[in-house]
């Protein structure tokens, strides 16, 4: 099974090396998840032509995937550490239902999909420790998530393929924006 950063022998600090700081651990963790997304995207792109599809904007309108915007304070312009950290955690919590949807969408990369989901949960915990302003973080309602999951799973095959592609692309983009922002903190 895929290992999380810190479980791999390569990540264990050598006798004379410095242990990872909290920021370095988070950085490494996000990069680990991004590598997992890359593997999942590879399988998705190989089995369908969704990655080159021009119809994705149509499908995207029906998905409410978390997205970074300038007001979130994570971009270089208008950067705000507290606002941004809240946005990252809130966004990751919102992505959880979509990551759950991905669990039965892969054949050869089933373990990878599970690893992405589990390490995202761990990442949220890391970031919650880092956040001072926890009051501003809203957790999605379990009932809302359950009905969204049912709705997504009831789509036809083409829409399910498109949804998978869009979730992976959006999650990758969200994590990359998060990574860039966290490196400024």
């Amino acid at each position: 099974a895929p290992v999380l950063p810190g479980e791999d022998s390569k990540d264990v600090a050598a006798p004379h090396s410095q242990p990872l700081t909290s920021s370095e651990r988070i950085d490494k963790h996000i990069r680990y998840i991004l590598d997992g997304i890359s593997a999942l995207r590879k399988e998705t792109c190989n089995r369908s032509n969704m990655c080159e599809s021009s119809k994705e904007a149509l499908a995207e309108n029906n998905l409410n995937l978390p997205k970074m915007a300038e007001k979130d304070g994570c971009f270089q312009s208008g950067f705000n550490e507290d606002t941004c950290l809240v946005k990252i955690i809130t966004g990751l919590l919102e992505f959880e239902v979509y990551l759950e949807y991905l669990q039965n969408r892969f054949e050869s990369s089933e373990e990878q999909a599970r690893a992405v989901q589990m390490s995202t949960k761990v990442l949220i915990q890391f970031l919650q420790k880092k956040a001072k302003n926890l009051d501003a973080i809203t957790t999605p309602e379990p009932t809302t998530n359950a009905s969204l999951l049912t709705k997504l799973q009831a789509q036809n095959q083409w829409l399910q393929d498109m949804t998978t592609h869009l979730i992976l692309r959006s999650f990758k983009e969200f994590l990359q924006s998060s990574l860039r922002a966290l490196r400024q903190m």
Epitope: D27, K28, S38, C51, E52, S77, S170, E173, R180, Q184
Partner: antibody, heavy 123, light 107 residues
Framework: QVQLVESGGGLVQPGGSLRLSCAAS????????MTWVRQAPGKGLEWVSS????????AYADSVKGRFTISRDNAKNTLYLQMNSLKSEDTAVYYC????????????????WGQGTQVTVSS | DVVMTQSPSSLPTSLGDSVTITCQAS??????LSWYQQKPGQTPKLLIY???KLQTGVPSRFSGSGSGTSFTLTISGLEAEDLATYYC?????????FGQGTKVELK
């Protein structure tokens, strides 16, 4: 094959404006980060600005912040650099570059470069 | 801002020599460092990304190492076509920054 072709350079007076364009072909433009890098005569390389694929996230060097604006038109496969309030120190060859793609998801590295367009700011 | 200090600025050498160029970051940049080669009148070319990963098509005599704040580009057995200026680039945090460059030339 991948091609990046810059245009829009030229001679402009201090305080003037120019808009550089970079026409991309041979790859799915919308999937890649794009960056402008410049090189003043006889000097080293200077990172100017980057724009990310779908987020609209942009970043600028301190030397151009507030004067330059990077943008992209994914439908036209074109990258732009709007340069306002130009100064003599902006004189350089401006290169359009593509960030590494594929499995490489975080590492910044510019794998394709255009031939560059000359910008000269002089009175 | 992360400041990159590249050394030496000039490196007189002989063909066949092993050449080492270093880049020092003012703070940790993980492995977000790339190396470029630029010959006179030509556009820069990516050699190494992720501190140590060799870009496709680049000869294996080029290698990169380092992590955190200290990075090295090594050319094992310099060839005539390697005479050029070399730059490092930190891609860890804004604003990204190139090193000042190292000109590799014959003694």
């Amino acid at each position: 094959q991948v091609q990046l072709v810059e245009s829009g350079g030229g001679l402009v007076q201090p305080g003037g404006s120019l808009r550089l364009s970079c026409a991309a072909s041979g790859f799915t433009f919308s999937n890649y980060y794009m960056t402008w890098v410049r090189q003043a005569p006889g000097k080293g390389l200077e990172w100017v600005s980057s724009i990310y694929s779908f987020s609209g996230d942009t970043a600028y060097a301190d030397s151009v912040k507030g004067r330059f604006t990077i943008s992209r038109d994914n439908a036209k496969n074109t990258l732009y650099l709007q340069m306002n309030s130009l100064k003599s120190e902006d004189t350089a060859v401006y290169y359009c570059t593509r960030n590494l793609g594929g499995v490489v998801v975080t590492t910044n590295g510019y794998d394709y470069w255009g031939q560059g367009t000359q910008v000269t700011v002089s009175s | 801002d992360v400041v990159m200090t590249q050394s030496p600025s000039s490196l007189p050498t002989s063909l066949g020599d092993s050449v080492t160029i270093t880049c020092q970051a003012s703070q940790s940049i993980s492995d977000e460092l790339s190396w470029y080669q630029q010959k006179p009148g030509q556009t820069p070319k990516l050699l190494i990304y992720g501190a140590s990963k060799l870009q496709t098509g680049v000869p294996s005599r080029f290698s990169g190492s380092g992590s955190g704040t200290s990075f090295t580009l090594t050319i094992s057995g310099l060839e005539a076509e390697d005479l050029a200026t070399y730059y490092c680039l930190q891609g860890y945090s804004w604003p990204f920054m190139f090193g000042q460059g190292t000109k590799v030339e014959l003694k």
